[in-house]
């Protein structure tokens, strides 16, 4: 038999400090987690302790926090070569600076192969791309080989920015003649390395014919065997077990997310290459673990510039951007306007003729929404004044509804109005209405929703059925603030993009903002 | 070295029941699935079914539905396949083999057990 | 389920003769095939799997070809050891099936 540790890690998104418990900023340094350099202890130790090791990242390296803001994934390229990745899958998110932004900074730099089988490249940009990202590689350890084949959520086009010159395939389809080739080669151990969720990787390891193991990413799940070393609760034990359709079991892996935990799987074959055996457990990356000095050191190098960007001008407002408690837990506030606005912009993808936009809808709670922005600083908008309006480190996310759901939702927003309570939601691509004077549970008497499927927007009423994309905070979209709705009704959830770095990108879009309180949010007394 | 051996003849009369045992060593038991095979006198080969001994999983063909049981004690390495309501056309050889999951090939075989139906 | 269907069920040939049988499946099975041989009174044994590769310890005038849904078995320069009964069997899709069997006689 033979032995192959695989240490993973996916959905990093931009964590190489170390974070709080939470993934936020560090404050306690003797109570933090991750970070490349204690990630690179770690990886060190077991590749000293153990023959056959692999390194490999299931994608969404790429956004997060202001090292990805200011670099543009040239730290990534840096560090992730620094600690030896054998391989890395794309995410959705290795699209958000589009196709340049990819190539430039990540494929072009990385030392280690980039993988997706199901992303095919045409026209011009076929040949630009070629060999800069590959559907597999054969990668030797030891004294075998082993295939690693990559995949990429088919959802890409309507979360990220991969241009209209990548094709995003169906993965299954797209995987099997690329492993059936591996398979030619004489390859008998093959890896699916990818970022298209767990029930996506559950299919592959069900589906895909001759891939002995999935390692995962896309959907943060955490699997752990045993009692769990931290706050997160296991989706199911580490590995996950799943039966192929002609009867393998599969190991499935995934890591979390954040660079708090480092996959550690180990897998015994036989030299026909089945799995005869598998087991590990994702490792806590906390503070028993030191941080590498050397790499700490290249941490702190690269820190500098950071710190020069937080107070460089972003764009300017013309108007106050009133982020205060007092407004936006009680009513429209145009500093939940401004951020709703930019949060629709940064989800503008025209994929389909039939609509002007996939998403139309926002919504925000306002206690997410922790500070004003005064004009009176020659307007001046920086990074340091958007920490201070979202300093949770959260993303905007997109999630499918039912309109129900969102009904629900709204009735939640002001069911224990005048308390100044987080869930009073602010609003983008609706108009709601409503009557105080009603108990709690029936307040809302008009919900008007814009159209996506439409070639001039408009508001029309929203149907109880029908299915709607709407972009939100990640804290709501996990039932913060009481939405336990939400979290418990969703269809369908995907992490978006740093929150600061949604609404730092629009205003230096705009230059200029003057956001106004416009009638999204309505109250009214009587019949309607 | 791997092998797999079987428990000896059995003679049964119609509408009894057989219970065949397949004893493995050489390997990690856990990690193959066991094939059960038959073949009646001057016939071919006859796939069954098989068990997965690491979670009991087990895999039947239609025709025997129903009829057959296959079990594995890890503890001993043994994995058993009993047949109930004989008829006198069960009567055949029966073979365990392990199978290899990359190809689906059944690489290690028992010496097979004859088992006749008659009343 | 997959239909397995040799040919010949039988046939004659003298040691040194190239023999070829053949196997066709009911529905495209890749290259999924495997092919055992069996002496009378014994277990089968692995020869071949996946269309062409040897098992260990076999012969190398054993090789196998094709793919889809037609496949061959061809023994190079027959033996006195190689008169036996030759089945194919598919590992596409459960559950697993056998060919009827090639009955290789001596001439």
């Known amino acids: 038999a033979w032995e192959l540790t695989i240490l993973h890690t996916n959905d990093v998104h931009s964590r190489l400090e170390q974070t709080s418990e939470d993934s936020s900023k560090c404050v306690n340094a003797s109570r933090c987690m991750g970070g490349v350099a204690r990630l690179f202890t770690k990886v060190q130790q077991i590749r000293r302790a153990e023959p056959n090791v692999l390194l490999l990242d299931a994608g969404d390296q790429y956004q997060g926090t202001i090292w990805f803001t200011v670099y543009k994934g040239a730290e990534v390229a840096h560090f992730m070569n620094a600690l030896r990745y054998d391989a890395m899958a794309l995410g959705n998110h290795e699209f958000d600076n589009g196709v340049e932004g990819l190539i430039e900074p990540l494929l072009k730099e990385a030392k280690f192969p980039i993988l997706s089988a199901n992303i095919k490249a045409k026209g011009p940009l076929a040949s630009q791309i070629s060999g800069l990202y590959l559907p597999y590689k054969v990668l030797p350890v030891g004294d075998e080989v082993v295939g690693i084949v990559g995949y990429t959520s088919k959802e890409t086009p309507f979360l990220s920015n991969p241009g209209t010159n990548l094709v995003f395939e169906d993965e299954i389809t797209a995987l099997q003649p690329e492993v059936d080739k591996l398979k030619t080669l004489n390859v008998n151990k093959i890896i699916a390395l990818g970022h298209s969720g767990f029930e996506m990787d559950k299919l592959i390891a069900q589906k895909v014919r001759g891939v002995d193991v999935v390692v995962g990413g896309h959907s943060n799940t955490f699997l752990y065997t045993g009692n769990p070393p931290s706050k997160e609760v296991p989706a199911g034990k580490y590995p996950f077990i799943v039966t192929s359709d002609d009867g393998r079991k599969v190991p499935v892996v995934q890591a979390y997310a954040f660079g708090k935990y480092l996959g550690y799987l180990k897998i015994e074959f036989d030299e026909r290459g089945n799995v005869i055996s598998s087991h590990g457990n994702p490792i806590l990356l906390n503070s028993s673990i030191p941080e590498d000095p050397s790499i700490k050191a290249d941490i702190n190098k690269w820190r500098i510039k950071l710190d020069n960007y937080s107070t460089q001008e972003l764009g300017k407002t013309i108007v106050y951007l009133d982020g205060s408690s007092q407004s936006c837990r009680f009513r429209e506030c145009n500093m939940g306007n401004l951020i709703c606005d930019a949060m629709i912009n940064n989800n503008l993808r025209h994929t389909d003729e039939m609509f002007w936009n996939h998403v139309s809808m926002c919504i925000l709670n306002g206690g997410g929404i922790r500070s004003p922005i005064d004009e009176r600083n020659n307007g001046t908008i920086t990074w340091e004044n958007l920490a201070a309006v979202l300093p949770f480190g959260g993303t905007f996310d997109l999630v499918q509804l039912k309109g129900s759901t969102l009904k629900k939702a709204f009735e939640h927003s002001v069911h224990r109005y005048g308390q100044s309570t987080g869930e009073f939601l602010q609003v983008g691509g609706i108009h709601v209405v409503y009557d105080l004077s009603r108990k709690p549970g029936d307040r809302v008497v008009k919900l008007d929703v814009l159209c996506t499927k439409c070639r001039v927007p408009s508001y029309d009423p929203l149907k109880m059925d029908e299915v709607y994309k709407v972009i939100l905070p990640n804290f709501l979209a996990n039932g913060g603030d009481g939405f336990q709705m939400i979290k418990d009704e969703l269809l369908r959830h995907d992490s978006g993009d740093q929150d600061i770095n949604v609404v730092s990108t629009y205003i230096s879009k705009m230059k200029v903002i003057y956001p106004a309180v416009e009638g999204r949010i309505k109250f009214s007394t009587g019949s309607h | 070295q791997v092998q797999l051996v079987q428990s000896g003849a059995e003679v049964k009369k119609p509408g009894a029941s057989v219970k065949v045992s397949c004893k493995a060593s050489?390997?990690?038991?856990?990690?193959?699935?066991i094939q059960w095979v038959r073949q009646a006198p001057g016939q071919g080969l006859e796939w069954m079914g098989a068990i997965y001994p690491g979670d009991e999983d087990t895999r039947y063909t239609q025709k025997f539905q129903g009829r057959v049981t296959m079990t594995a004690d890890t503890s001993i390495s043994t994995a058993y396949m009993e047949l109930s309501r004989l008829r006198s056309d069960d009567t055949a050889v029966y073979y365990c083999?392990?199978?290899?999951?990359?190809?689906?090939?059944?690489?290690?075989w028992g010496q097979g057990t004859t088992v006749t139906v008659s009343s | 389920d997959i239909q397995m269907t040799q040919s010949p069920s039988s046939l004659s040939a003298s040691v040194g003769d190239r023999v070829t049988i053949t196997c066709r499946a009911s529905q495209d099975i890749s290259n999924y095939l495997n092919w055992y041989q069996q002496k009378p009174g014994k277990a089968p044994k692995l020869l071949i799997h996946y269309t062409s590769r040897l098992h260990s310890g076999v012969p190398s005038r054993f090789s196998g070809s094709g793919s889809g849904t037609d496949f061959t078995l061809t023994i190079s320069s027959l033996q006195p050891e190689d008169f036996a009964t030759y089945y194919c069997q598919q590992g596409d899709t459960l559950p697993w099936t056998f060919g009827q069997g090639t009955k290789v006689e001596i001439k």
């Open positions: 050489g390997y990690t038991f856990t990690g193959y699935w």
């Open positions: 083999a392990r199978g290899n999951w990359d190809d689906w090939d059944f690489d290690v």
